[in-house]
């Protein structure tokens, strides 16, 4: 029969695991919100700002199904920042853009871990910034929907 100490340690492990899952869920929801906010701002100013933004090429992973694949998103945050620099002026202040990218980077690292040994396999086909954001939004939604509640 299990001792009370082994029972309590397995309970503590289960609680810790549940806590980690909750944190992961919160980080995913935060990332999803940030990506949706970026896309929404771009679409709100579409005639003024999108033409210039759509000249930038982004690259998506061949396949993205796990949190480690967020390395591919992290790799593209530099180019994303360049695009956001274009949106400063009336629609999007520069410090706002810096903040967004910084927040996304922090959230991504929390989700995928700080180990950078995983090398992203990018698709050969490029995507516009709108398609890029939509694809990562769909990725977050997919992981959230399949996560144990």
């Amino acid at each position: 029969a299990p001792t009370s100490s082994s029972t309590s340690s397995s309970t503590a492990e289960a609680q810790q695991q549940q806590q980690q899952q909750q944190q992961q869920q919160q980080h995913l929801e935060q990332l999803l919100m940030d990506l949706q906010e970026l896309l929404s701002r771009m679409e709100n100013y579409r005639n003024l700002k999108l033409p210039r933004m759509l000249t930038f090429k982004f690259y998506l992973p061949k396949q993205a199904t796990e949190l480690k694949d967020l390395q591919c998103l992290e790799d593209e945050l530099g180019p994303l920042r360049h695009v956001l620099d274009l949106t400063q002026s009336k629609s999007f202040q520069l410090e706002d853009a810096e903040n967004f990218i910084s927040n996304i980077r922090v959230t991504v690292v929390k989700l995928k871990g700080s180990d950078n040994t995983f090398e992203c396999q990018f698709d050969d086909e490029s995507a516009t910034v709108v398609d890029f954001l939509r694809r990562w939004i769909a990725f977050c939604q997919s992981i959230i929907s399949t996560s144990p509640q």
Epitope: R46, N47, L48, L50, P51, R52, M53, L54, T55, F56, K57, P79, H82, V83, D85, L86, S89, K90, S126, T128, V130, D131
Partner: antibody, heavy 126, light 108 residues
């Protein structure tokens, strides 16, 4: 249909000022960027700059910054390119062109400059 | 300032394939657009976003891009394709547009 109609040919002397125009019709003039392109005799196309008539946000090519002024009057759907003091080297064909961003369903397609004016010939000679 | 480099001329026999290249340091991250300009006429867009064809442009026109090079291909060139072709893209910042020097295509 969507069209850009430019003002007629101009013959000027060095040092004179000039303002040529580009009138848009068949679309919402304030919602699309309009660019200006120079083509000197027998030479290639050169991008000069661009304006968003909705709020007059203007970008110039570094090569043309300070040499010309791009403006727009949204009340009459017209964009302008002007010089305060012409030089013989300004002799060229000048085109205005509209940048097109199309939304098809939830997808966006950016066509670059796909609607062009007929061009305005500017000759500067003493 | 940013530059796009094209060959000055390309010759092709009718029915053969003509390839026009355009090189620029920013092209791995920026889309290329291609214009056709026939003598005495305004330019016409033939390819956008590297490889997409606007409606009304014949299927023999196609575009591709790899690294710092974009390519316009005319498969089965016809006499009416004789024109100057310009690539067009933005600099790294995305604020300024640049045309390539243009390529004169002769269909002999």
């Amino acid at each position: 249909q969507v069209q850009l109609v430019q003002s007629g040919a101009e013959v000027k002397k060095p040092g004179e000022s000039l303002k040529i125009s580009c009138k848009g019709s068949g679309y919402s003039f304030t919602s699309y960027w309009i660019g200006w392109v120079r083509q000197m005799p027998g030479k290639g196309l050169e991008w000069m700059g661009i304006i968003y008539p909705g709020d007059s946000d203007t970008r110039y090519s570094p090569s043309f910054q300070g040499q010309v002024t791009i403006s727009a009057d949204k009340s009459i759907s017209t964009a302008y390119l002007q010089w305060s003091s012409l030089k013989a080297s300004d002799t060229a064909m000048y085109y205005c062109a509209r940048e097109t961003l199309a939304a098809v369903g939830s997808n966006y397609y950016y066509y670059g400059m796909d609607v062009w004016g007929q061009g305005t010939t500017v000759t500067v000679s003493s | 300032s940013y530059e796009l480099t094209q060959p000055p001329s390309v010759s092709v026999s009718p029915g053969q394939t003509a390839r026009i290249t355009c090189s620029g340091d920013a092209l791995p991250r920026k889309y290329a657009y291609w214009y056709q300009q026939k003598s005495g006429q305004a330019p016409v867009l033939v390819i956008y976003e590297d490889s997409k064809r606007p409606s009304g442009i014949p299927e023999r026109f196609s575009g591709s891009s790899s690294g710092t090079m974009a390519t316009l291909t005319i498969s089965g060139a016809q006499v009416e394709d004789e024109a100057d072709y310009y690539c067009y893209s933005t600099d790294r910042s995305g604020n300024f547009w640049v045309f390539g020097g243009g390529t004169k295509v002769t269909v002999l």
